[in-house]
């Protein structure tokens, strides 16, 4: 239903502070250098005409569209030119070329330093001091440095750290207690982000249709007991919240999500058996609860479909009369049948059965020639199933931190092009799958392993994007979304790349490295193994683990050692001259 | 080709116990479902049990307690451990195993319960 002022129906029904957390993020997603303070500014500003508009809907600018109030706000801030630069010509546009502007100047790699945790005492006392500023600095930082994240899930986050923070300030121990419970929150939210961030890139790429299908396809594998109405009615809503959220409309985005919450709740007999949890939960959880909800028992008598799909004479018939719903039929009884399969690969599938038809429903014989489709499954079938055997067997033989390494090397091969920064960044990420996924049951592999990939390469290739460098990086980047993964893993050696020249300063370290965390040590290991494998692409496995032994024995040698300095200046140059010739 | 081959079936006491093992031979690949089923003398062909891909279970409500229905992936496998056996149980047992392409069945085996 129309509202006579939009501002003042999402006031209402989101509340005041979910309706101020989600304006700081928008701000906060399109002005990604602003301080927290010049976005706080901003929020209050708006919230204060929202309560103006909902005491009068009739008063002056409450009738106008929220991109409109927003972009306004946005382009009166001061030097803005200064600060952003081109960004500042989007003000000179209307709605609604103006707001896509703005999206198009989202930066998915700013330039702003890592997001560092205060220690516990100092984070407890801004907590305590005003947990409302301490909460919009979560927000503000975390957006900005992830300009698509799900900002309905990002208010969720919030509450947790919020949550968290409440328990830990009042034990003794403050700091175990935080550490792993927000590096906990953390890693979900850097995965939560990547996983958007597919989404927003699907949508912008391919449109909605292509969303549709994925969400069609996972649906279908968490709910297969609902029906195919009910499926396309909830692929439908999922598919409008996350198109609103990618573009920007955060308020409409979160409210039809509690809508799409309160639907799910309200129909649980023909949707799961499983919701009911989630159900007993407030907005926030319910919402992120419902999203990861375990899949419904299979039904435990499907048939085959065979007879509907390959066997039935009006295939060609039924397929031409309303193409996407019986392919999206197909999606739906192919999925609900495959839990144990990711996303990508259905996708893959249905992809393949469309294909098959186009060419066979224009034949002289079309049930002679689409007669064998679904045998010529099995290849797509059997390729992601060695992918995760292969790659969760080397997990389990390697560890996390070598099976990093692995892909390290083996991306660095594939793309030597790409900055070491990014190449490491990819390989701990794409490393982490296996402790993430290769400990699940067998049936929960495949589409761990394969989906959470695919997310990740489509940050690489969001970030090649930016500067193209590679001729392999662009020919899987600019493929479909559901071919990339398969794209990458059939990469080998670039043999058009001229190797690096040596640099012993490359391979130099200093004694500082020894006080630095865990995970900075390994970063500057991994980007000296990339930096190798660009040296000598063509090193095997052998040479380059003699080298990174070496290496590690030096570094634990010279940390150890009374005069640090002297061990890391007199033993580096002689660690140099053995990389050299072990690499020689 | 696929072949499906079960074994195990046989006579036995009531409260007496039998393993059904069934193995399927040939290229089968993307199993969704399997399952057992059973005929007595002059009845329909009724599901006994059924194992899903997720590893979700079914019984028939007159085996529940007694029966248990396991998979083995790698082997393509599926048994029925039937304990506490019934006269009522006495029937050929079928094993079939599904995937999007088809359904395919066993020859049965018999199993009789009988003092």
């Known amino acids: 239903e129309a509202h006579k002022s939009e501002i003042a129906h999402r006031y209402n029904d989101l509340g005041e502070q979910h309706f101020k957390g989600l304006v700081l993020i928008a701000f906060s997603q399109y002005l990604q250098k602003c301080s927290y303070d010049e976005h706080a500014k901003l929020v209050q500003e708006v919230t204060d005409f929202a309560k103006t508009c909902v005491a009068d809907e009739s008063a002056a600018n409450c009738d106008k569209s929220l991109h409109t109030l927003f972009g306004d706000k946005l382009c009166a801030i001061p030097n803005l030119r200064e600060n952003y630069g081109e960004l500042a010509d989007c003000c000179t546009k209307q709605e609604p070329e103006r707001n896509e502007c703005f999206l198009q100047h989202k930066d998915d790699n700013p330039s702003l330093p890592p997001f560092e945790r205060p220690e516990a005492e100092a984070m407890c006392t801004s907590f305590k001091e005003n947990p409302t500023t301490f909460m919009g600095h979560y927000l503000h930082e975390v957006a900005r440095r992830h300009p698509y994240f799900y900002a309905p899930e990002l208010l969720y986050y919030a509450e947790q750290y919020n949550e968290i923070l409440t328990q830990c300030c009042a034990e003794a121990d403050k700091e175990s207690c935080l550490t792993p419970k927000l590096d906990g929150v953390k890693e979900k939210a850097l995965v939560s982000s990547v996983r958007q961030r597919m989404k927003c890139s699907s949508m912008q790429k391919f449109g909605e249709r292509a969303f549709k299908a994925w969400a069609v396809a996972r649906l279908s594998q968490t709910f297969p007991n609902a029906d195919f109405a009910e499926i396309t009615k909830l692929a439908t809503d999922l598919t409008k919240v996350n198109k609103e959220c990618c573009h920007g409309d955060l308020l409409e985005c979160a409210d039809d999500r509690a809508e799409l919450a309160k639907y799910m709740c309200e129909n649980q007999a023909t949707i799961s058996s499983k919701l009911q949890t989630c159900c007993d939960k407030p907005l926030l959880k319910k919402a992120h609860c419902l999203s990861e909800v375990e899949h419904d028992t299979m039904p435990a008598d499907l048939p085959a479909i065979a007879a509907d799909f390959v066997e039935d004479q009006e295939v060609c018939k039924n397929y031409a009369e309303a193409k996407d719903v019986f392919l999206g039929t197909f999606l739906y009884e192919y999925s609900r049948r495959h839990p144990d399969y990711s996303v990508s690969l259905l996708l893959r599938l249905a992809k393949k059965y469309e294909a098959t038809l186009e060419k066979c429903c224009a034949e002289a014989n079309p049930p002679a020639c689409y007669g064998t489709v679904l045998a010529e499954f099995q290849p797509l079938v059997e390729e992601p199933k060695n992918l995760v055997k292969t790659n969760c067997d080397l997990y389990e033989k390697l560890g996390e931190y070598g099976f990093q390494n692995a892909i390290l090397v083996r991306y660095t091969q594939k793309a030597p092009q790409v900055s070491t920064p990014t190449l490491v960044e990819a390989a701990r990420n794409l490393g982490r799958v296996g402790t993430k996924c290769c400990t699940l049951p067998e049936d929960q592999r495949l589409p761990c392993v394969e989906d959470y990939l695919s997310a990740i390469l489509n940050r690489v290739c969001l970030l090649h994007e930016k500067t193209p460098v590679s001729e392999h990086v662009t020919k899987c980047c600019s493929g479909s979304l559901v071919e990339r993964r398969p794209c990458f893993s059939a990469l080998t050696v670039d043999e058009t790349y001229v190797p690096k020249e040596f640099k012993a300063e490359t391979f130099t370290f200093h004694s500082d490295i020894c006080t630095l965390p865990e995970k900075e040590k390994q970063i500057k290991k991994q980007t000296a193994l990339a930096e190798l494998v660009k040296h000598k692409p063509k090193a095997t496995a052998e040479q380059l683990k003699t080298v990174m032994d070496d290496f590690a024995q030096f570094l634990d040698t010279c940390c150890k050692a009374a005069d640090k300095d002297t061990c890391f200046s007199t033993e580096g140059p002689n660690l140099v001259t053995r990389c050299k010739d072990a690499l020689a | 080709q696929v072949q499906l081959q079960e074994s195990g079936g046989g006579l036995v006491q009531p409260g007496g116990s039998l393993r059904l093992s069934c193995v399927a031979s040939?290229?089968?690949?993307?199993?969704?479902?399997m399952g057992w089923y059973r005929q007595a003398p002059g009845k329909q062909r009724e599901l006994v049990a059924s194992i899903t891909v997720d590893g979700s279970t079914h019984y028939a409500d007159t085996v529940k307690g007694r029966f248990t229905i396991s998979k083995d992936n790698a082997a393509n496998m599926v048994y029925l451990q039937m304990n506490a056996l019934e006269p009522e149980d006495t029937a050929v047992y079928y094993c079939d195993i599904r995937n999007v392409g088809g359904d395919y069945w066993g020859q049965g085996t018999q199993v009789t319960v009988s003092s």
């Open positions: 040939g290229s089968i690949w993307g199993i969704y479902h």
